[in-house]
Amino acid sequence: CDLPQTHSLGNRRALILLAQMGRISHFSCLKDRHDFGFPEEEFDGHQFQKAQAISVLHEMIQQTFNLFSTEDSSAAWEQSLLEKFSTELYQQLNDLEACVIQEVGVEETPLMNEDSILAVRKYFQRITLYLTEKKYSPCAWEVVRAEIMRSLSFSTNLQKRLRRKD
């Protein structure tokens, strides 16, 4: 499956929108930094076959979409930016889902790399727990926004590597 060029443009747009969503000075939030244990090894793209990599990417985007679709998120961010961001993620999910369907017939290995998918889910559980413990404070959301920007950058890099393999 060849992800369309619009997909990588969507990635960049999503990152730009996320960067624009900041509302308070980041400098005041330093003490709220937290180790969410991003599963970096799931995004290095070496041990994966393409179908598995696409599944992990899909889970990453799906969980990001879910996180920013909550009521607490709506209260934290400027509505029009949040809507645009969610729209970009939704489009990426559609692209990836189309790829997942194509790749099922191409590879004999199981589509879902369960351990990798689980690692991504647990990562987002840690993020949600952190937000809960911090009572969804503005600084907690800033820390999470910075973390998601970092993890989406890893996703973007994995997609670039997948395109180079084609």
């Epitope: 980041h26 400098f27 939030c29 330093l30 180790d35 820390v143 910075a146 973390e147 970092r150």
Partner: antibody, heavy 121, light 107 residues
Framework: EVQLVQSGAEVKKPGESLKISCKGS????????IGWVRQMPGKGLEWMGI????????AYSPSFQGQVTISADKSISTAYLQWSSLKASDTAMYYC??????????????WGQGTLVTVSS | DIQMTQSPSSLSASVGDRVTITCRAS??????LNWYQQKPGKAPKLLIY???SLQSGVPSRFSGSGSGTDFTLTISSLQPEDFATYYC?????????FGQGTKVEIK
């Protein structure tokens, strides 16, 4: 390869202005903050201030507030430290270093090579 | 501002010695404490971040510990290339501040 490359040594007279630079490469420049550190001859490290190149938000140490200006041009991945009127006491080595912002990653993991500023009449 | 106090300000040691440098913050900084090594004419080099995490490429003889206000840098077996000045720095809140430095000299 991540690199921070600073502009060359400067010799200035008291009262003159100066702008030194720090160019980042090998990483996403807007994903890291850039901090500036002063080291006067034979002395320790002093933290001056920091900039977030993504939005040019700055913060200064009280000792340097109003004495220097930190800026950045993200289009050319460069941060700046400037003086409008130098004093002899500004003679020092100035370092830039990158900081991961709110991400859980090593602080100030890469440093520039330093810019030696000499102010003398 | 948070004050960082290092001790000792200098020490003499021999190759193979175990060396300990302490750093005390004037208020709690959780684990947001970094250690740097600086050699004459060179930029500082990050050794330890978040109080105890070893920076990539740094030899395992360097270790850090502590939380809150009291922190320690330990060099388990001093090597010739370790003779330098060491600085602690807090990154809990702005302005970031450095300790005054500890110079490790050859005995």
């Amino acid at each position: 390869e991540v690199q921070l490359v600073q502009s060359g040594a400067e010799v200035k007279k008291p009262g003159e202005s100066l702008k030194i630079s720090c160019k980042g490469s090998g990483y996403s420049f807007t994903s890291y903050w850039i901090g500036w550190v002063r080291q006067m001859p034979g002395k320790g490290l002093e933290w001056m201030g920091i900039i977030d190149p993504s939005d040019s938000d700055t913060a200064y140490s009280p000792s340097f507030q109003g004495q220097v200006t930190i800026s950045a041009d993200k289009s050319i991945s460069t941060a700046y430290l400037q003086w409008s009127s130098l004093k002899a006491s500004d003679t020092a080595m100035y370092y830039c270093a990158r900081h991961p912002g709110l991400n859980w990653a090593p602080d100030f993991d890469y440093w520039g090579q330093g810019t030696l500023v000499t102010v003398s009449s | 501002d948070i004050q960082m106090t290092q001790s000792p300000s200098s020490l003499s040691a021999s190759v193979g010695d175990r060396v300990t440098i302490t750093c005390r913050a004037s208020q709690s900084i959780s684990k947001f404490l970094n250690w740097y090594q600086q050699k004459p004419g060179k930029a500082p080099k990050l050794l330890i971040y978040f109080a105890s995490s070893l920076q990539s490429g740094v030899p395992s003889r360097f270790s850090g510990s502590g939380s809150g206000t009291d922190f320690t840098l330990t060099i388990s077996s001093l090597q010739p290339e370790d003779f330098a000045t060491y600085y602690c720095q807090q990154s809990n809140t702005l302005p970031f501040t450095f300790g005054q430095g500890t110079k490790v000299e050859i005995k």
